[in-house]
Amino acid sequence: SGTTNTVAAYNLTWKSTNFKTILEWEPKPVNQVYTVQISTKSGDWKSKCFYTTDTECDLTDEIVKDVKQTYLARVFSYPAGNVESTGSAGEPLYENSPEFTPYLETNLGQPTIQSFEQVGTKVNVTVEDERTLVRRNNTFLSLRDVFGKDLIYTLYYWKSSSSGKKTAKTNTNEFLIDVDKGENYCFSVQAVIPSRTVNRKSTDSPVECMGQEKGEFRE
């Protein structure tokens, strides 16, 4: 039980895409504020989003320090005008989040086709290597830098004039596919991490078609 009129947070949920990671919870506060703490299993608690009336807290800066660690967060509830006040057990009311391992659980963002180039009967399709907020040596790493060969892309492609699709895979960010000369093709890609059991696939990228500006044609 907590202090009068203070309720514990509930429905603590991690929302994470390409390592941009936000903890969300309920309820919208009435005469109370929240503070969030985050820790690795073996680490110390670090406080974030002090005395906020928001019901979300961006924890990206903490989780990108080591995306392979497992994190736990907790949300403390305090009376709005009296943040020193504690629960009957002598400490503020709080609720724990589920555990979260960014490397295994962050959603894969919708990929983007960067370019495609036709040379004769071959087309090279390049997927944009999206920058993440994960840092190494003061530079931001791309999705490929972080996941390496764990990340593959699936390409769907089809003649503009027909509905029959084909598919190809790559563990780089480039596809080289055979096409029929004189035909226009459309492309869409999807990111996949085969070794995962959840959040394995992204949504499909926007469709890009030959004859539009992203492409280049050479005999």
């Epitope: 699936t154 598919t167 895979k169 596919i177 999807q190 059991t197 949504t203 499909d204």
Partner: antibody, heavy 117, light 107 residues
């Protein structure tokens, strides 16, 4: 425990149709690609096609493109194969399989389709 | 379509023998090559993926090698339960295509 159970096989008249079901349990089909394979008696495996149940993309072997339709009902966690204009050479055991994108880690037990008058 | 040529189509071997099966692709498949084992009346079972990675629960006597167009499955010491048909499968692009299969029989 992951399980794939095919059903809907049996005797079909030449020129007829079949609709096979692949009921999945122990995982969410939306997280994977689901494929259909077949194997004629005493022959090798033959790929029919696949579906990404979440996005709805389907890909077929060109030889089945005009006769096969793969679909999925995510609420039932089930994939389907519809094949039309059946002929004697379509007699086979039909398997569904889960594809991780690296390999097929689970197959169903198979369902036998016999096309005969 | 990518053609997969598997050899031999059958072989006879004894328990304890070292067995090698090869698969050649009609063009570079960039190690998108899996090996499957199938026993009569049963569904296939994955042994090797990405040409060289041993699937979970598969005994270490099975190994895969190769790159580009040429790939090999090796069984270092054949066991009684290994008598079966083996298939290579390319999954780098559609349509997925398989070798014709290699039946490993008891000598």
């Amino acid at each position: 425990e992951v399980q794939l159970v095919e059903s809907g096989g049996g005797l079909v008249q030449p020129g007829g149709s079949l609709r096979l079901s692949c009921a999945a349990s122990g995982f969410n089909i939306k997280e994977y690609y689901m494929h259909w394979w077949r194997q004629a008696p005493g022959k090798g495996l033959e790929w029919v096609g696949l579906i990404d149940p979440e996005q709805g993309n389907t890909i077929y072997d060109p030889k089945f493109q005009d006769r096969a339709t793969i679909s999925a009902d995510n609420s039932k966690n089930t994939a389907y194969l519809q094949m039309n204009s059946l002929r004697a050479e379509d007699t086979a055991v039909y398997y569904c399989a889960r594809d991780t994108a690296a390999y097929f880690d689970y197959f169903g037990q198979g369902t036998l389709v016999t096309v005969s008058s | 379509d990518i053609q997969m040529t598997q050899s031999p189509s059958s072989l006879s071997a004894s328990v304890g023998d070292r067995v090698t099966i090869t698969c050649r692709a009609s063009r570079d498949i960039k190690s998108y090559l899996n090996w499957y084992q199938q026993k009569p009346g049963k569904a296939p079972k994955v042994l090797i993926y990405y040409a060289t990675s041993l699937a979970e629960g598969v005994p270490s006597r099975f190994s895969g090698s190769g790159s580009g167009t040429d790939y090999t499955l090796t069984i270092s010491s054949l066991q009684p339960e290994d008598f079966a048909t083996y298939y290579c499968l390319q999954h780098g692009e559609s349509p997925w295509t398989l070798g014709q299969g290699t039946k490993v029989e008891i000598k």
